[in-house]
């Protein structure tokens, strides 16, 4: 439902996708019960949500992962919500950290990130994790989205 | 504050209620500092939030639970946000999983779920957990809500 | 972007600040990639977000902390989102609890709180934790905000 041609609703919710890439940037897809309100927000290269209009956005991500303390590095599992704006440095908007579980073979944990940020036209947001191979891609476990206020 | 008769604010926030039922669906109540904006969203049978208008909604749930690895099944504690729409499959919208704690008698953990979804008129959302007896019902620990964009 | 003079957007996102104070109330600052939409929401005394207009608000907080079971009290780490309204008792809106980690020297964990609440003019919201010395203040780890529906 539109608020009016001048002020349409802008929202997205995308679903995690397992990837063979070694990058720490999570991959997403428009599959399952996804949301893509219109072309004022787009999923680019399966990795970032890009907005066409300036404004305040509530941006969120949820990451479920399965890790084991002995099999992982000593550093915790960290999920970061990051921002790329044209002509600006990339920035970390939000981060969450969870120490690895002692459960075997691995222990599942879920992280939720969310906050209100001003985005410029052409700004992109993406999610980084310390070890993408530990991320759970079962139905509903890992997702990423935004809504324009 | 209303946006106008044609576009009233629609929001709800309900509070967890302990239940003697053996169902995995959590029970909720309009008690404490709850929110129920108007009759365009209702709490039905103490278990599901039902909306009358189609549109994009941000839906969230928070579940705090107390469990112990030895006393629990090997499977993690999972909270699921689910959707019922007339004439459609029930769906899992979001899930989070936390491995049980080794703390005794039990270790508390909190899960937060949230995302943007399109709901049809008459659609209902509800929260499932693997073991409702482990859920914490102290003030503020477990709640469920939505807001229409 | 404003909705109109009568109905401007109201939103805030503030960043955690380490404090030498012994109080359990977390301290916040307008620094880094913060949001403060206008003077209809203000950060007071670095500790509470205060709103000038009545209405429904989505309020959220994220707290990352690092603790160890042996070095901490037996009680879990609890984060509380609290409300102060003129002439009313303070109230707990939301709480989350996480048992301390067995990781050494400490194990990091993140908590996310969020919900929709009616606020009165002059109402303030703030975040309490059981042990502020355990809170992580690295970029993006701990933040607090709201948006008016």
């Amino acid at each position: 439902m539109q608020k009016g041609d001048q002020n349409p609703q802008i929202a997205a919710h995308v679903i995690s996708e397992a990837s063979s890439k070694t990058t720490s940037v999570l991959q997403w897809a428009e599959k399952g019960y996804y949301t893509m309100s219109n072309n004022l927000v787009t999923l680019e290269n399966g990795k970032q949500l890009t907005v066409k209009r300036q404004g305040l956005y509530y941006i969120y991500a949820q990451v479920t992962f399965c890790s084991n303390r002995e099999a992982s590095s000593q550093a915790p599992f960290i999920a970061s919500l990051c921002l790329k704006s044209p002509g600006r440095f990339e920035r970390i908007l939000l981060r969450a950290a969870n120490t690895h579980s002692s459960a075997k073979p691995c222990g599942q944990q879920s992280i939720h990130l969310g906050g209100v940020f001003e985005l410029q036209p052409g700004a992109s947001v993406f999610v980084n994790v310390t070890d993408p191979s530990q991320v759970s891609h079962g139905t509903g476990f890992t997702s990423f989205g935004l809504l324009k206020l | 504050m209303q946006k106008g008769d044609q576009n009233p604010q629609i929001a709800a926030h309900v509070i967890s209620e302990a239940s003697s039922k053996t169902t995995s669906v959590l029970q909720w109540a309009e008690k404490g500092y709850y929110t129920m904006s108007n009759n365009l969203v209702t709490l039905e049978n103490g278990k599901q939030l039902t909306v009358k208008r189609q549109g994009l909604y941000y839906i969230y749930a928070q579940v705090t639970f107390c469990s112990n690895r030895e006393a629990s099944s090997q499977a993690p504690f999972i909270a699921s946000l689910c959707l019922k729409s007339p004439g459609r499959f029930e769906r899992i919208l979001l899930r989070a999983a936390n491995t049980h704690s080794s703390a005794k008698p039990c270790g508390q953990q909190s899960i937060h779920l949230g995302g943007v979804f399109e709901l049809q008129p008459g659609a209902s959302v509800f929260v499932n957990v693997t073991d409702p007896s482990q859920v914490s019902h102290g003030t503020g620990f477990t709640s469920f809500g939505l807001l229409k964009l | 972007m404003q909705k109109g003079d009568q109905n401007p957007q109201i939103a805030a996102h503030v960043i955690s600040e380490a404090s030498s104070k012994t109080t359990s109330v977390l301290q916040w600052a307008e620094k880094g990639y913060y949001t403060m939409s206008n003077n209809l929401v203000t950060l007071e005394n670095g500790k509470q977000l205060t709103v000038k207009r009545q209405g429904l608000y989505y309020i959220y907080a994220q707290v990352t902390f690092c603790s160890n079971r042996e070095a901490s009290s037996q009680a879990p780490f609890i984060a509380s989102l609290c409300l102060k309204s003129p002439g009313r008792f303070e109230r707990i809106l939301l709480r989350a609890a996480n048992t301390h980690s067995s990781a050494k020297p400490c194990g990091q964990q993140s908590i996310h709180l969020g919900g929709v609440f009616e606020l009165q003019p002059g109402a303030s919201v703030f975040v309490n934790v059981t042990d502020p010395s355990q809170v992580s203040h690295g970029t993006g780890f701990t933040s607090f905000g709201l948006l008016k529906l």
Epitope: H13, E30, K31, G32, Y33, Y34, T35, M36, S37, H137, G138, T139, G140 | L56, R88, F89, R91, I92, F117, E118, Q120 | -
Partner: nanobody
Framework: EVQLVESGGGLVQPGGSLRLSCAAS????????MGWFRQAPGKEREFVAV????????LYADSVKGRFTISADNSKNTAYLQMNSLKPEDTAVYYC????????????????WGQGTLVTVSS
């Protein structure tokens, strides 16, 4: 499009069991979820159970929880509904349905449907 063929319906006494099968053919790689609905005489079609192809997650209607079990054999592109402790109120035509990938939350995507199989619970 996906073609669905149900089998396994019939007459059974209260407390008895039946196993329904639903064989899928055609664009089976495009199936996101498979499940069952039922329609009793003079009533609307209602959801019974669903299984997600990605990870085997399942959901059930309250009325059948603990009695019915949905499962799938991906190698045979077949979904099953094991129905135990059957009651007279379970009498209905049972329809298999498949939901395609990428339907999205903003689209009321069309399901593919089977022709239905009749289950009668009576003594």
């Amino acid at each position: 499009e996906v073609q669905l063929v149900e089998s396994g319906g019939g007459l059974v006494q209260p407390g008895g069991s039946l196993r329904l099968s639903c064989a899928a053919s055609g664009r089976t790689s495009n199936i996101y979820a498979m499940g069952w609905f039922r329609q009793a005489p003079g009533k609307e079609r209602e959801f019974v159970a669903v299984i997600y192809s990605s990870d085997g997650s399942t959901l059930y209607a309250d009325s059948v929880k603990g009695r019915f079990t949905i499962s799938a054999d991906n190698s045979k592109n077949t979904a099953y509904l094991q129905m135990n402790s059957l009651k007279p109120e379970d009498t209905a035509v049972y329809y298999c349905a498949a939901e395609p990938y990428g339907s999205g939350s903003s689209l009321m995507s069309e399901y593919d449907w089977g022709q239905g199989t009749l289950v009668t619970v009576s003594s």
